[in-house]
C-alpha cells in the first residue's frame, strides 16, 4: 500500500452539493513520491471526459499529500455534472474516480435547501 505509485484520492460515488453564485474549490488529492505529476481536470459528457482548458487551477500542499484544485469563481448552473482528475506519470495516465457537483440555482430556489434535503438527492 505504501508504494511510490501516483494515487488520486477522489472517492467513488462522492458528490458535493453547492449553490450557483458561490465560489467553490474542487480538490483532487494527489499522492506522489519524488516528482509531482502533471494533473488535469475533465468533465464527463456521457462516457467521454472532456478536458477543461483555460480554467483557474492551483496546487496546495498538506503534510504528505498535495491537492490539485479546480476553482469555480463563481459556480454556474452549467457546472452541474461529474468531474474527474487524471495524472500523467511516467507516460502513463492515471484516472481518478468521478465526483459529482449538484448545483442548485438560487434564482430558481425561493430559499436554500437544507443539507438533509441536498443529501437525499
Amino acid at each position: 500500500k505504501e508504494s511510490c505509485d501516483v494515487q488520486l484520492y477522489i472517492k467513488r460515488q462522492s458528490y458535493h452539493s453547492i449553490f450557483a453564485g458561490d465560489p467553490f474549490k474542487l480538490e483532487c488529492p494527489v499522492k506522489y513520491c519524488a516528482h509531482r505529476p502533471q494533473v488535469t481536470w475533465c468533465k464527463l459528457n456521457g462516457t467521454t471526459c472532456v478536458k477543461l482548458e483555460g480554467r483557474h487551477t492551483s496546487w496546495k500542499q498538506e503534510k504528505n499529500l498535495s491537492f490539485f484544485i479546480l476553482h469555480f469563481e463563481p459556480v454556474l448552473p452549467s457546472d452541474n455534472g461529474s468531474y474527474r482528475c487524471s495524472a500523467n506519470f511516467l507516460s502513463a495516465i492515471i484516472e481518478s474516480h468521478s465526483t459529482t457537483l449538484y448545483v442548485t440555482d438560487v434564482k430558481s430556489a425561493s430559499e436554500r435547501p437544507s443539507k438533509d434535503e441536498m443529501a437525499s438527492r
Partner: antibody
Framework: EVQLQQSVAELVRPGASVKLSCTAS????????MHWVKQRPEQGLEWIGR????????KYAPKFQGKATITADTSSNTAYLQLSSLTSEDTAIYYC??????????????WGQGTTLTVSS | DVVMTQTPLTLSVTIGQPASISCKSS???????????LNWLLQRPGQSPKRLIY???KLDSGVPDRFTGSGSGTDFTLKISRVEAEDLGVYYC?????????FGGGTKLEIK
C-alpha cells in the same frame, strides 16, 4: 499502519440512545469513507451506511434511515454512529470500516474490532 | 436491494483439500465504470472481518495465493486450493456496486 479503535462494549436501556465512536490512526479519514456494519449474535453482516468525512455527506441503507446517524470529526480523526430509540433488536456488534481509495482502485481494508452493544433493562 | 446468495451454508473440509464457495447476486455487479465491486471477507472466530479479495479477483496484501476469486456479472466463486487450519471461519461475499451495499449470508468453513 492503519488502525481503527472502538470501545469494547456498551450497555444501554431500551428507548435510550447511544453514540459509538471509531478513531482512526495512521490515515487521514478525510481521504476515505467510513462505514458502519451491524452483526447480530450468530448472524451475518448488515451495512448500515457511510460518511464522507471530507464534507459530511452520508448514505444510509433504507432499513437504518431514522435509526442511525453517522457523523465524523476530522480534527480527531473519529467517526461516530448514533443509534436512537433502542430496542433488543439493536443488540449487536457494530463494526466501523474504512474504505481506502487510490486511483480507480477500491479498497475496503480496515475494520475496527467492533463494539458490542447490549440493550437491556 | 441486491440479494447475495451464498452456497453452501457450511463446508466441512479436510486440511490439504480444496474448497469452493459460490456467491450469486440478484443483478449484475458490473458497474458503469467497467469494474465489478465484489469482495470476499473472512471472519475468523471471535474476530472482526478481514477482506481477502476485492474487485472479484485481486488478492489483498498478505493473503496467501492459495485463495483465488473468479466470476463476472452475477456469478462469483472463491476457491481455496489447499485448506489450512487458519482458514476456518465464516466467508462472506460483499457487493459495493449498487446502493445499498449488501453482504451474502456467509459460508462457515469447518475443518474435518
Amino acid at each position: 499502519e492503519v488502525q481503527l479503535q472502538q470501545s469494547v462494549a456498551e450497555l444501554v436501556r431500551p428507548g435510550a440512545s447511544v453514540k459509538l465512536s471509531c478513531t482512526a490512526s495512521g490515515f487521514n479519514i478525510k481521504n476515505t469513507y467510513m462505514h458502519w456494519v451491524k452483526q447480530r449474535p450468530e448472524q451475518g453482516l448488515e451495512w448500515i451506511g457511510r460518511i464522507d468525512p471530507a464534507n459530511g455527506n452520508t448514505k444510509y441503507a433504507p432499513k437504518f434511515q431514522g435509526k442511525a446517524t453517522i457523523t465524523a470529526d476530522t480534527s480527531s480523526n473519529t467517526a461516530y454512529l448514533q443509534l436512537s430509540s433502542l430496542t433488543s433488536e439493536d443488540t449487536a456488534i457494530y463494526y466501523c470500516a474504512l474504505t481506502y481509495y487510490g486511483s480507480s482502485q477500491y479498497y475496503f481494508d480496515y475494520w475496527g474490532q467492533g463494539t458490542t452493544l447490549t440493550v437491556s433493562s | 436491494d441486491v440479494v447475495m446468495t451464498q452456497t453452501p451454508l457450511t463446508l466441512s473440509v479436510t486440511i490439504g483439500q480444496p474448497a469452493s464457495i459460490s456467491c450469486k447476486s440478484s443483478q449484475s455487479l458490473l458497474d458503469s465504470d467497467g469494474k465489478t465491486y465484489l469482495n470476499w471477507l473472512l471472519q475468523r472466530p471471535g474476530q472482526s472481518p478481514k477482506r481477502l479479495i476485492y474487485l472479484v479477483s485481486k488478492l489483498d496484501s498478505g493473503v496467501p495465493d492459495r485463495f483465488t476469486g473468479s466470476g463476472s456479472g452475477t456469478d462469483f466463486t472463491l476457491k481455496i486450493s489447499r485448506v489450512e487450519a487458519e482458514d476456518l471461519g465464516v466467508y462472506y461475499c460483499w457487493q459495493g456496486t449498487h446502493f445499498p451495499q449488501t453482504f451474502g449470508g456467509g459460508t462457515k468453513l469447518e475443518i474435518k
